[in-house]
Each structure stands twice: as structure tokens, then as C-alpha cells.
Interface confidence: low
């Protein structure tokens, strides 16, 4: 069967479709037809998009031509440019691909020209008269998302029949644009209609999960379910998975979320990604990647050892200075052969007794007025009153290797009466005295929140360090960390910069540009000026919430809010053309950066289909104004103002009869 005598056909990816309409039309008629369906003439700007067009067009008859969305006004030759002065009907000239059939002609370009694609061979581009009616045209439709084609079911009478928003009906789609309808006919007589809709959890999906056709319940093949099959009251079957597994997108098979999870140490099903990673005792999640585990340096925790501490992978050991020996608790030191540490032992027990109520603990907290200082490699306590210094408090970025805190000069030897915390590998690792790393600590029990006693005299509220409430929505409560109270004299909270947390409670994929099967944005490199934050995650900005009730006495609370930081695209690499014509690479001209897309997919608002016609270039603020389609003269006779928020350049159809008299090449395909 001649495909050119057949109905229109389309090829869809996850975010755009190309459709071939085998209808004889002029360029203007073709452009108008695509626009009326909510799309635009095709704009294959990359080798990958060209491949999709190739697969759709197939091997057509040798002489057939199809309009694509490229046109050039009279006297607009720019032969040195990749598009030779042609402009996409979306209004721009950005491209990473060209496929001209012939080298550029050196003439003066006296007439408006349009581009058609050969239906055979390598689908090269030919320029010719826009008023010529060619064999068909290619449209392109962008959309917010797509549903995968439905799996065939045992009880189906035939394949699902799909109807797209641009009125194409076929059984052959791999992806169905948002708004498509699937009609399934069942052997038992009744059928089902499904709509590709937005899902509450984000993305798009079919309005109903399978199975769609009433079969023989769960027999004979367990209803197609991998694990458990449940026969519902209405005769439908639904599938369930055994504990620790989750139902896959097909509604039938079961997945072990931890099987594919890239956790370095321990994985647990659940959480927004379907799994959450945990680290063994003595380790904590890496700040740059919560899937990896790094050794907790317990020696950085104030008071973890009474005198000296040595960290090793997975744990730590306490040591005592000469003349002292380590007590049985592995933490305290006493003079050799004496019981001199009993005072500190009592104080430590009072501070950290699990049975104490909050008031008592608070009193104990205020009982010790000593400061603490740090020497490289050794943590120890000093009972001297610290000077009233202002804390230079900053987020812990890679370039800030140490917090800028003017410590008093250390004294030696270390005293014996310092408060301490007991030997718990579960104690939060605070690698810098005041900055809390917002990653999942490995806590064996929610009943033992680690408290790090390093107190000073009661300070006015203005001088209290805010406490960070580090909440982890994707962790079970047993993994929630306790509050870390670290009171130092500090600047008033208003002067503190916002902390940037490196924890992302919900990891949504960045919006993807319309390409298939792996989407990308050609020619855009996005960088943020925030070290340590993955580029495809929106960082959380921790902002001060002074109006909130305090989490602990005399402490302000910092709560994480999912505030989107503006992401500023840096200078973008220029797009370059790919030419299938035998042109040497020296002829490849880079498109200047000024013509690059200025918008970032991650930040694009939800767009209507008419605004999605350009897969690479979202609308530029500096795009040129729409050109009004003209027929046989300068004044528009047709109301072609279709609603579209995107500035698009409509083609123009100049009366070319007069021009043809001057140039006999006008109506030929060059």
C-alpha cells in the first residue's frame, strides 16, 4: 500500500510528536494546518530529531516532497550561516543540524523561499518557491508529558486504538501525548476508554490501571500478576506485591526498590524514591551524595573523649595524657592509680541520664559554664570563661574549610572536670563546631537524641545561636536526629546568611526537553553558583523562622523551607551545525551565544501545546516579533491570530508571479 495514499501518521517521544500529513498544500496552507492542530511545521534542529523524522517519513517515493518549518524572506541571504538566512517558523535560527541537498547558491535571493524535505533517501532539504503545492507536510507537536502505549492483555479483542489531541487515530504509537484517548475492545464485549491525564503525584499517566478487560479472574495465569492476584467485587483483578516490594508501572510486576538502588551500605524500601539509604554505625551519608557513606569523625564531637581522641574508619578511641589512665568506660581519664575523675563522672551522668526530664536536663545544661576549644587532631575542654566574641557564622561550603570562630588560645594540660558525652557511635557528627551537616545520621534509637554539652552563661535571646531542626521526611522516625544544641555567643540571627541544606527531601527529575528517547537540551549547560548541590535538584534554602515556637529554651529554630533558588545559566556553548552534505568541517559555523536559548527547562512554566513547538529553544525574551502571514500583498486578509503565548514567526506568502518573470529558477527545487 502506498503510504502517500494513506492517512496521516505520527511518531511520538515522551515530550513531542512529529506527524506526517500526505496532503498537497502550499507552504502557507501547511503552516496554517499545523497551527490549527496546536502544533507547528516540523523543526528538526538536532541529529536525534532528524533521526525521528527519518523513521516517520520512511522510504517515500523518490520525487515526493514535504514542507518543514523553514522559510526565508526575499533578499535575506546569509549564505555563511548554517541556515543560510532561513528562519524556523518558531521565529529563531538556532540549530545543531542541517541537511541541505545542495551547496548554497551564490545568488542575490530575490524571492521568498521555503524548505521541503525529500521523502526518500537521506531526506535532504531543498529550497524552493513557497507558493508551490508539494506532496505533504510535517508537523511537530510539543506537550507536557506522554503516556507509554498500553500493554496488550489476554482478554483484548485487538490492539488499543489511540486518538491524539491532534486528531490522529492509530494503533501504532509507542508514546501517547497528554490528552490522548486509548480505546480498548475486550473479547467479552465490553470495552474501556482511558485518558492520558496528569497524575496527582506529578507527571502524566493513564486514567486507569490495567487489567482493562474482564477475564477469568486470577486464573489461569494469576491474573498476569507477578506476586499476589486479588479478584475485586466488579470482576476486575488487581495485583499486589509482597512486603518489601512495590508494584511496577505496568500494574502487574513487582520491583524490589533496593535491587537497583545505588546505596553503598544499607537500603530500606520506602521514601519518595522508593528506597532510602542508610549507613552503618560509625558512618554517615556523604554530603555530596546521600547514597554513599563516609566515616564519622567522632573526634570532632565536643567531649566525646575526656582528653585525647583518635578516629578510625567506623569508630574512635580515647586516650589519656601521660600520668593519667583510661577508665573502664573507655572515655574518662583519671590520674594513674586515683579516682580524680569522679566529679566529672557525676556531672556527665547527670547531663546524659536517659531518665532525666527536660527541666532537670536544662538545669544541668546551665550548671557548667566552661568553654571548649579545639586543637588540631585533639578535642579537649577548658573551664575558662570565654570572651564575649561575635561568631562569624557561615554556611559550610567547600571553600570554607573551617568555621571562622575566634577561639581563645588553648591551654595545656587538659582539665579533668570537663563534661562529656557517653560512648555512643550514634552521636551526631559535627565536623565543624557550629555548622550542622544536614545529612542522615545513623541513629539506632529515637530515644537517645545526642546532646552536645558545650554551654556558656545564659545569653539574651539576641545572642543565641539558632538551633537547626533537621527534618528528614523520607526517614522513619527512628532515624530522625535529635536536636543539636550548641550555644555560643553569636551575632543576632538577622545578620546570619541563610544556610543551604544539602538534603533534598523530594528529588524530582528536571523538566526535560522534547527529545526521544533520552531527553536533553542541546547547547545549554546549566551551572549554579552553589558548591556541592547537584545541578538537577532544587536546593533547599533554610530560612529563619523567628515567629515559630522555639524548639528548646532560649533557642531560635531554623526550619527548612523548600524555597527554589534562582538558577542562573552561565554562558552557553554555541550550537553547531551537523551537515550530512559533503561539506568540509571548515564550513561549520557556530551560532553565536546570543542566539542561544535563554530559558532553562527546569524553570519553565507549564506551557500550552502551542508554546512547545520548538524542542530546543524555549521562547526567547529577545525573539523577534511575529511576522504576519501575507497572501498576495502586504495587508493580512486572514485572521490567523491563534492563541499562543509564544512569539512565533508566521510565514509570509508573497505574490511571486511577478518575481518569477525575473528569475526562472524560482519555481524549481534547487
Amino acid at each position: 500500500q502506498d503510504p502517500w495514499a494513506a492517512e496521516p501518521r505520527a511518531a511520538c517521544g515522551p515530550s513531542s510528536c512529529y506527524a506526517l500529513f500526505p496532503r498537497r498544500r502550499t507552504f502557507l496552507e501547511a503552516w496554517r494546518a499545523c497551527r490549527e492542530l496546536g502544533g507547528d511545521l516540523a523543526t528538526p534542529r538536532t541529529p536525534e530529531e532528524a533521526q525521528r523524522v527519518d523513521s516517520l517519513v520512511g522510504a517515500g517515493p523518490a520525487s515526493r516532497l514535504l514542507w518543514i518549518g523553514l522559510q526565508r524572506q526575499a533578499r535575506q541571504c546569509q549564505l555563511q550561516r548554517p541556515l543560510r538566512g532561513f528562519t524556523w517558523t518558531t521565529g529563531d535560527q538556532d540549530t545543531a543540524f542541517t541537511n541541505w541537498a545542495q551547496p548554497a547558491s551564490g545568488g542575490p535571493c530575490p524571492a521568498q523561499r521555503c524548505v521541503a524535505l525529500e521523502a526518500s533517501g537521506e531526506h535532504r532539504w531543498l529550497e524552493g518557491s513557497c507558493t508551490l503545492a508539494v506532496d505533504g507536510y510535517l508537523c511537530q507537536f510539543g506537550f507536557e508529558g506522554a503516556c507509554p502505549a498500553l500493554q496488550d492483555e489476554a482478554g483484548q479483542a485487538g490492539p488499543a486504538v489511540y486518538t491524539t489531541p491532534f486528531h490522529l487515530v492509530s494503533t501504532e504509537f509507542e508514546w501517547l501525548p497528554f490528552g490522548s484517548v486509548a480505546a480498548v475492545q475486550c473479547q467479552a464485549g465490553r470495552g474501556a476508554s482511558l485518558l492520558c491525564v496528569k497524575q496527582p503525584e506529578g507527571g502524566v499517566g493513564w486514567s486507569r490501571a490495567g487489567p482493562l478487560c474482564l477475564g477469568t479472574g486470577c486464573s489461569p495465569d494469576n491474573g498476569g500478576c507477578e506476586h499476589e492476584c486479588v479478584e475485586e467485587v466488579d470482576g476486575h483483578v488487581s495485583c499486589r506485591c509482597t512486603e518489601g516490594f512495590r508494584l511496577a508501572a505496568d500494574g502487574r510486576s513487582c520491583e524490589d526498590p533496593c535491587a537497583q538502588a545505588p546505596c553503598e551500605q544499607q537500603c530500606e524500601p520506602g521514601g519518595p524514591q522508593g528506597y532510602s539509604c542508610h549507613c552503618r554505625l560509625g558512618f554517615r551519608p556523604a554530603e555530596d551524595d546521600p547514597h554513599r557513606c563516609v566515616d564519622t569523625d567522632e573526634c570532632q564531637i565536643a567531649g566525646v573523649c575526656q582528653q585525647m581522641c583518635v578516629n578510625y574508619v567506623g569508630g574512635f578511641e580515647c586516650y589519656c595524657s601521660e600520668g593519667h589512665e583510661l577508665e573502664a568506660d573507655g572515655i574518662s581519664c583519671s590520674p594513674a592509680g586515683a579516682m580524680g575523675a569522679q566529679a566529672s563522672q557525676d556531672l556527665g551522668d547527670e547531663l546524659l541520664d536517659d531518665g532525666e526530664d527536660e527541666e532537670d536536663e536544662d538545669e544541668a545544661w546551665k550548671a557548667f559554664n566552661g568553654g571548649w576549644t579545639e586543637m588540631p587532631g585533639i578535642l579537649w575542654m577548658e573551664p575558662t570563661q570565654p570572651p564575649d566574641f561575635a561568631l562569624a557564622y557561615r554556611p559550610s561550603f567547600p571553600e570554607d574549610r573551617e568555621p571562622q570562630i575566634p577561639y581563645p588560645e588553648p591551654t595545656w594540660p587538659p582539665p579533668l572536670s570537663a563534661p562529656r558525652v557517653p560512648y555512643h557511635s550514634s552521636v551526631l557528627s559535627v565536623t565543624r563546631p557550629v555548622v550542622v551537616s544536614a545529612t542522615h545520621p545513623t541513629l539506632p534509637s529515637a530515644h537517645q537524641p545526642p546532646v552536645i554539652p558545650a554551654t556558656h552563661p545564659a545569653l539574651s535571646r539576641d545572642h543565641q545561636i539558632p538551633v537547626i531542626a533537621a527534618n528528614y521526611p523520607d526517614l522513619p522516625s527512628a532515624y530522625q536526629p535529635g536536636i543539636l544544641s550548641v550555644s555560643h555567643s553569636a551575632q543576632p540571627p538577622a545578620h546570619q546568611p541563610p544556610m543551604i541544606s544539602t538534603k533534598y527531601p523530594e528529588l524530582f527529575p528536571a523538566h526535560q526537553s522534547p527529545m526521544f528517547p533520552d531527553t536533553r537540551v542541546a547547547g545549554t549547560q546549566t551551572t549554579t553558583h552553589l558548591p556541592g548541590i547537584p545541578p538537577n535538584h532544587a536546593p533547599l534554602v533554610t530560612t529563619l523562622g523567628a515567629q515559630l515556637p522555639p524548639q528548646a529554651p532560649d533557642a531560635l529554630v531554623l526550619r527548612t523551607q523548600a524555597t527554589q533558588l534562582p538558577i542562573i545559566p552561565t554562558a552557553q556553548p554555541s550550537l553547531t551545525t551537523t551537515s550530512r552534505s559533503p561539506v568540509s568541517p571548515a564550513h561549520q559555523i557556530s551560532v553565536p551565544a546570543a542566539t542561544q536559548p535563554a530559558a532553562l527547562p527546569t524553570l519553565l512554566p507549564s506551557q500550552s501545546p502551542t508554546n512547545q513547538t520548538s524542542p530546543i529553544s524555549p521562547t526567547h525574551p529577545h525573539s523577534k516579533a511575529p511576522q504576519i502571514p501575507r497572501e498576495d500583498g502586504p495587508s493580512p486578509k486572514l485572521a490567523l491570530w491563534l492563541p499562543s503565548p509564544a512569539p512565533t514567526a508566521a510565514p509570509t506568502a508573497l505574490g511571486e508571479a511577478g518575481l518569477a518573470e525575473h528569475s526562472q529558477r524560482d519555481d524549481r527545487w534547487l
Partner: antibody, heavy 116, light 107 residues
């Protein structure tokens, strides 16, 4: 699971022909470009040929144009490379790869030795 | 044809080190540059597509950057398992071309 399995390699004399096959499974074969890539110890990785989704569009490196033919049987989910007029410089391990611009899945490779 | 030049040819590192591998194109390839890893006696495996997008299942220790003609593959905290040859490839224009590769060895 995506799988590509090549077959048909071996020893062949210069000037003779050989046909390689690649059986594909685990994905919708008709939706993907496919390619052959070869690797000779002296030359590193070398793209040989690609075919469009329908098999109608084919691309070849200059040194094999006119001698090699890439084709596909969508019904059988199989990719082929017909190699005629073989030369000693065609000696290499030939990989079948799924190609959407980049090569995201590769077969285990099949060794072709052209020698008299 | 677009020629891709990789450097160094061989790189010998200590486990735990961070290394950078370079790939330079004779003409701009836009963002159509990809990286592969090939372990001894194995088929190549896609690491990075389109300059910096990690392929699924690739450890986050592997990252890449660049644009136009200069590209870099970075490997943090090198492990024994990373002993491989690393190739860059362009899909900007036919013929598709690969770099000659960088061989990573462990001291």
C-alpha cells in the same frame, strides 16, 4: 533486560565475504537506530555503519562504503552486516550497538580475522 | 571528519585520587559528546551522554563537563575497579568518531 548477541565471525580470506548477525531483545527493536562499531588493537574504536529505524536510511564510514551493507529484519529483531571484498585492515572485533546518537547498549562482540 | 584527541594516553594513579581525562575536538561538537568505559576483555559501556548527563547505574564519582571543543571526564576517589580505557565519542556529524582512548592504571 536489553541484550545484543552477535554471531557469524571467524577467519576469512581477503576478497571474500562474511555476514554478521546481531539478535536484539529486551526493547522495541523497531524504534531504535542500530549500528556496528569495530575495534582493532591498533586502531581503537571505529564506527562502521548505522541504520535508521526502518532500515531505509543507512550511513557508512568512507573506508567500507560500497563493500559493507547494514540491514535489519524488524520482524526477527535482528541486525546484519554483510561484508564483501574484505581486506586485512577489516580485522577487528565487531560490536553491535543500539544507537540513538550515543551507543547505550553494546553486544559482547564477535571477532573477524581477514588473513590468507 | 571530526577528530577527537584524548590525553593523556595512559594515566597511573593511586586509589583515592581524583583524576581528569581530556578530550579535544577538531571542530565544535556542541553538546553531542559522550564518554565510554571499557574494562579489559569487555565491551564498552556508556558512562556519560551529552557532555555531562550520567547514564543510569553509573556511580556519582564519575562526572564530566565541557562545551564546544574541550571536554573533561572526572573520576573522584579512584578505585581498583576503575582500571579501564576511557573513550570519548561525537555524534555531531557523520561519520561518528571516537577518541583513541585514555588507559587508566592503578599504581
Amino acid at each position: 533486560e536489553v541484550q545484543l548477541v552477535e554471531s557469524g565471525g571467524g577467519l576469512v580470506q581477503p576478497g571474500r565475504s562474511m555476514k554478521l548477525s546481531c539478535s536484539a531483545s529486551g526493547f522495541t527493536f523497531r524504534n531504535y537506530y542500530m549500528a556496528w562499531v569495530r575495534q582493532a588493537p591498533t586502531r581503537g574504536l571505529e564506527w562502521v555503519a548505522s541504520t535508521g529505524t526502518g532500515g531505509d536510511f543507512t550511513y557508512y564510514r568512507d573506508s567500507v562504503k560500497g563493500r559493507f551493507t547494514i540491514s535489519r529484519d524488524t520482524a526477527e529483531n535482528t541486525l546484519y552486516l554483510q561484508m564483501d571484498s574484505l581486506r586485512s585492515e577489516d580485522t577487528a572485533t565487531y560490536y553491535c550497538a543500539r544507537a540513538y546518537g550515543y551507543f547505550d547498549y553494546w553486544g559482547q562482540g564477535v571477532k573477524v580475522t581477514v588473513s590468507s | 571528519d571530526i577528530v577527537l584527541t584524548q590525553s593523556p594516553t595512559t594515566l597511573s594513579v593511586t586509589p583515592g585520587e581524583t583524576v581528569s581525562l581530556s578530550c579535544r575536538a577538531s571542530h565544535s561538537v556542541g553538546t553531542n559528546l559522550h564518554w565510554y568505559q571499557q574494562k579489559p576483555n569487555e565491551s564498552p559501556r556508556l558512562l556519560i551522554k551529552y557532555v555531562s548527563q550520567s547514564n543510569s547505574g553509573i556511580p556519582s564519582r564519575f562526572s564530566a563537563s565541557g562545551s564546544g571543543t574541550d571536554f573533561t571526564l572526572n573520576i573522584k576517589n579512584v578505585e581498583f575497579n576503575d582500571v579501564s580505557s576511557y573513550f570519548c565519542q561525537q555524534t555531531q556529524s557523520w561519520p561518528l568518531t571516537f577518541g583513541a582512548g585514555t588507559k587508566l592504571e592503578i599504581k
